[in-house]
């Protein structure tokens, strides 16, 4: 199975010298960037990438290892430090405060300084720290956010919202008395805390009364709207944009992203987290890929540039049922969507970044030989006299004992999407793992992206490479041709 | 198959104390749920207690039940209803049940009588 | 908030049409979170109607809610024999004290 050039020296050594060469070449560019673009792969730790990319691979009829994801392609990359001010290991909203803020902050908290505390309401108001969409927006460009979760979920909601809990999605799970103290949920800020000019994603629910049928499932009362303030949250955001739409099926988000009249979008395309990509109808919702390419159309009208944060945020729901297929399909449709992207945009003026806010306990091992199933088995037998696979998990909801012995697999078995990757501990949701992750950077000012970070560091390189706030004395030459 | 069952009921005296416990299955409170208690005196229409939500552990009761019943989150999968201070006219069928509006899911009940 | 349902009982020939009305204190949250519960002895409620009009799961089309912030209807034409049972309103209004309430019940009795 192993190709017969690599068995020649020269096939790799011819390699590296193009790569060399490549590397030579490498010019920082000392030019602001116009337009900035985040790519956060939700949970994508390095054993992802490396996993994804066998799939991909693999999904191409190759032997997996020497694809190229798109991210590969990026020139610069460094190593971000995730850990939350309170926590080795930490969750989604502390990272988004501080890849999207440039301040760390505590467990579950978003948008705020660690002087927050989780779930107190009144530790909030003082504390609040300011994104870079936020400040791209004040310097006049137009902002979006686009993600497979809930548009009010952790990663996107550091984008927008200060908020103690990051599970106060709408005002019905906010506390009464978090309520009378002034804290607001996060659909309630999505709306009212800045104009955005681009939203898409799922959390339809949170944006409607309870009682409002789900325009998708309106016989399911379980999907319908949540909110007990009465308030019909995209029916004052339309009311504030005269050139506002909203959409909530993919039908609908083609025509309205071709439509020059449309000057705000927002597309809500299921009532919650939006489908895996395997289980997505795709006549009704869009894909990452698509929905990236809708905002892109959009936000590139604007002669100031854009920021867009993109998100695969479902990378993480598969890891924490570890389900790893979902997990790496997932992974793969972002890599897409940030193929889709790179075409659409020019190197010249748009600063793109791939990062993850956090990894995974999933690893990828047992000596498996080349070209076999990333889902398969590693060869021969485990000490139990068993079969394992190579993607297994340290803990999560895939440990079973049958007769208090750990189950045999088969290949059958561990090849569906349903299957759920054995690991050490039970636990009802895999978690998080705490080591660094890695940040890929292309474009204007993405020299800066280098060595060991901290994840603070990511919104900062944006900053300046924008000359936004507090790198407006940037000293940056505007990219020839720029208009103001 | 979702299910809701309560247990703990049983004679009591009046001016006692009793806890009624309500098991979940094939589902658990890490999702948000609103989690009500209801009763029906024998022969009687149904009368709302209160509830709680899951997700932020917020309670709400009906006046008359207000400082004598108290409904907790106790696991992911348990709901407790505290009673005090019981008196012959809270003898009744206690149903532990799913959702606010509407109500989704419903316990058999569990049977309460207060008695000397 | 208050919910006062009536009649309080009604016999119905097989194949009739019966109506139950149910009238909220003051208006519903959304206008229309009402639900209403069909309980037939030893047994628990059984949801037929949400949103005030919207059928619950499995539940026959001779089921028909209508009605909005105060006013209710609950109308079950063709009536069968097994629709003998009682039937509750319950209305929300907020998550507050009283913010739920049951109407009185309806027995329905099939002749």
């Known amino acids: 199975i192993i190709p017969v050039e690599e068995e020649n020296p020269d096939f790799w050594n011819r390699q590296a010298a193009e790569a060399l060469g490549a590397a030579k070449k490498l010019q920082p560019a000392q030019t602001a960037a116009k337009n900035l673009i985040i790519f956060l792969g939700d949970g994508m730790g390095v054993s992802t990438v490396t996993a994804a990319r066998i799939l991909k691979g693999q999904k191409k009829d190759k032997l997996g290892p020497e694809t190229f994801l798109a991210m590969d392609r990026f020139p610069y990359v460094a190593l971000s430090k995730t850990y939350s001010v309170d926590k080795h290991v930490p969750d989604s909203g502390a990272t988004a405060t501080a890849y999207l803020c440039g301040v760390k902050g505590n467990f579950q908290t978003i948008g705020l300084s660690a002087a927050a505390r989780f779930n107190q309401c009144n530790t909030t108001r003082g504390n609040e720290v300011i994104s870079v969409m936020n400040r791209a927006k004040k310097a006049g460009k137009s902002v979006g956010v686009v993600t497979t979760t809930r548009v009010q979920h952790a990663s996107p909601a550091g984008a927008y919202a200060h908020t103690v809990n990051r599970n106060w999605y709408s005002d019905a799970d906010v506390p009464a008395s978090a309520r009378q103290e002034g804290c607001q949920d996060i659909a309630t800020q999505l709306i009212s805390n800045m104009d955005i000019d681009v939203i898409l994603g799922g959390g339809r629910k949170y944006m409607f009364p309870m009682g409002t049928p789900d325009p998708e499932y309106p016989d399911d009362y379980s999907q319908g709207g949540t909110r007990l303030d009465g308030k019909n949250l995209v029916q004052e955001w339309l009311a504030k944009h005269q050139g506002a739409r909203y959409v909530w099926n993919r039908t609908e988000l083609l025509q309205a992203s071709l439509d020059p009249s449309v000057t705000h979008l927002m597309g809500l395309f299921e009532p919650g987290d939006m489908k895996y990509e395997i289980h997505r109808d795709s006549t009704l919702d869009p894909s990452l890929m698509e929905m990236t390419e809708a905002a892109l159309l959009l936000l590139s009208r604007n002669p100031r540039g854009f920021f867009l944060f993109v998100e695969g945020g479902r990378i993480d729901h598969g890891h924490h049922e570890s389900r790893a297929y979902r997990a790496l399909t997932e992974t793969i449709m972002f890599d897409d969507a940030i193929e889709r992207a790179g075409q659409l945009t020019s190197e010249e003026d748009t600063l793109s970044l791939v990062t993850a806010d956090h990894s995974h306990v999933f690893s990828f091992g047992g000596y498996p030989l080349r070209g076999s199933s990333i889902f398969g088995l590693a060869p021969g037998k485990a000490r139990d006299r068993k079969a394992y696979t190579v993607l297994l998990y340290g803990n999560g909801p895939g440990y079973v004992l049958k007769d208090g012995a750990r189950p045999d697999v088969t290949e059958s078995e561990s090849g569906s999407p349903e299957y759920r990757q054995q690991s050490a501990v039970p636990l009802d949701g895999e978690t998080h793992a705490g080591e660094d992750v890695a940040v890929f950077a292309r474009g204007p000012q993405a020299h800066l992206v280098h060595g060991v970070q901290e994840q603070t560091f990511i919104a900062h390189v944006m900053a300046f490479a924008a000359c936004l706030e507090p790198y407006t004395a940037c000293d940056l030459a505007p990219r020839a041709g720029t208009t103001d | 198959q979702e299910r809701l069952e309560e247990s703990g009921g049983g004679l009591v005296q009046p001016e006692g104390s009793l806890t009624l416990t309500c098991t979940a299955s094939g589902f658990s409170f890490s999702s948000s749920y609103y989690m009500c208690w209801v009763r029906q005196a024998p022969g009687k229409g149904m009368e709302w207690i209160g509830c709680?939500?899951?997700?932020?552990?917020?309670t709400w009761y009906a006046s008359w039940a207000k400082g004598r019943f108290t409904v907790s989150k106790t696991s992911s999968t348990t709901v407790t209803l505290q009673m005090t201070s019981l008196t012959a006219t809270d003898t009744a069928t206690y149903f532990c049940?799913?959702?606010?509006?509407?109500?989704?899911?419903w316990g058999p009940g569990t049977l309460v009588t207060v008695s000397s | 908030i208050v919910m006062t349902q009536t009649p309080s009982s009604k016999s119905v020939p097989v194949g009739d049409t019966v109506t139950i009305n149910c009238q909220a204190s003051e208006s519903i949250y959304n206008n229309n979170n009402l639900g209403w519960y069909q309980q037939k002895p030893g047994q628990p409620p059984k949801l037929l109607i949400y949103?005030?009009?919207t059928l619950a799961s499995g539940v026959p089309s001779r089921f028909k809610g209508s009605g909005s912030g105060t006013q209710f209807t609950l109308t079950i034409s063709d009536v069968e024999c097994d629709d003998a049972a009682t039937y509750y309103c319950a209305g929300y209004k907020s998550r507050t004290t009283d913010g739920s309430a049951f109407g009185g019940g309806t027995e329905v009795v099939v002749k």
């Open positions: 049940a799913r959702g606010l509006s509407p109500i989704d899911l």
């Open positions: 949103w005030a009009s």
């Open positions: 709680i939500y899951t997700g932020n552990d917020d």
